[in-house]
């Protein structure tokens, strides 16, 4: 079997979707004639070398766009970035590429995405909306870290 990424769509609990704007992912309320991104995701093939019970380690990209989500420090602050990268190139690497990996945890219909490189930091959107996706340590009211992931088959 040849492993291939799965495709999915994401929205948060406020029904905002992810859209690409100037090479940045932002969360906005869904409207007509809007084209939300389709997510590409694939599990890390070296799962046995990563932490157990934190979720399923996945690479997360934008389907058909050769862009993947990664975490990098800017100064002392972990930040979420989009990098030009083929998700299958990451998948095939001989070691987990931690900066591009996220622990995907599901609780009911809610999904969270925790950075493998920066444990305790989660993909989030500001509760205000219309803002770029960020990484946060604060799982409170200011940021939303719970997302609905619908797989597309």
């Amino acid at each position: 079997k040849i492993d291939t990424p799965q495709r999915g769509s994401i929205q948060d609990i406020n029904h905002r979707v992810w859209v690409l704007q100037d090479q940045t992912l932002i969360a906005v309320p869904r409207k007509d004639r809007m084209s939300p991104v389709t997510i590409a995701l694939i599990s890390c093939r070296h799962v046995e070398t990563l932490e157990k019970d934190r979720g399923n380690p996945i690479y997360l990209g934008l389907n058909g766009l050769n862009l993947c989500l990664m975490c990098a420090k800017v100064g002392d602050q972990p930040t979420l970035q989009l990098k030009e990268k083929d998700i299958m190139d990451l998948y095939n690497q001989p070691e987990p590429v931690k900066s591009f990996l996220f622990y995907h945890s599901q609780s009911g219909r809610n999904s969270t995405f925790e950075s493998v490189a920066f444990p305790g930091w989660f993909i989030a959107v500001s509760s205000e909306g219309g803002c770029p996706l960020i990484l946060t340590q604060e799982l409170g009211k200011a940021n939303t870290t719970d997302f609905g992931l619908t797989m597309l088959f």
Partner: antibody, heavy 121, light 109 residues
Framework: QVQLVQSGAEVKKPGASVKVSCKAS????????IYWVRQAPGQGLEWIGR????????RYDPKFQGKATLTTDTSTNTAYLELSSLRSEDTAVYYC??????????????WGQGTLVTVSS | QAVVTQEPSLTVSPGGTVTLTCRSS?????????ANWVQEKPGQLFTGLIG???DRAPGVPARFSGSLLGGKAALTLSGAQPEDEADYFC?????????FGGGTKLTVL
Amino acid sequence: QVQLVQSGAEVKKPGASVKVSCKASGFNIKDTYIYWVRQAPGQGLEWIGRIDPAIGTTRYDPKFQGKATLTTDTSTNTAYLELSSLRSEDTAVYYCARYDYSGSSFYFDYWGQGTLVTVSS
Amino acid sequence: QAVVTQEPSLTVSPGGTVTLTCRSSTGAVTTSNYANWVQEKPGQLFTGLIGGTNDRAPGVPARFSGSLLGGKAALTLSGAQPEDEADYFCALWYSNHLVFGGGTKLTVL
């Protein structure tokens, strides 16, 4: 600057154990993978295994499973290789190396100076 | 376990081109073997040259290039310099473990 400094040469008797250290500076070992490699006199390189210092998971070449144990102390930014039940065939220079992802691939970008372990009765 | 074989020694003239190869006992080397090349100069630390078959490590001169050639991993040195005289080792990935070759002693003469 980035450096890996290994402990000094050791002379051990057959059946004994030895622990070699590899102290990193200029980077945090939790941000990368530390590999261990050996070179016996007049021979090529042999991969022993690797450790992910952030979570402690290891991989070993099947030949070294049970012979080598890799650990780290992240508080001192140091990686360790322990070899047990030493035999004369374990006489070699042991190297630690950083295996790091940069741009699009993993590279062995920095190496320690090597530690000579001599096993002799 | 796989055996990785390199030319024991090669000689190149200053300014010349030489190709070092890395053969796998299991068959053709592919991009899935993620060939790495490292250099050892006398009295100096090892240096990583190539990762992922053909990606030069940061700071490595452009005269070094990695490729696949006739079912083997290859390291080509174009415009050899006296300071390139060294031992060169390749390493190939096989699933979850890494196997090094015996090394090639390159003389620039």
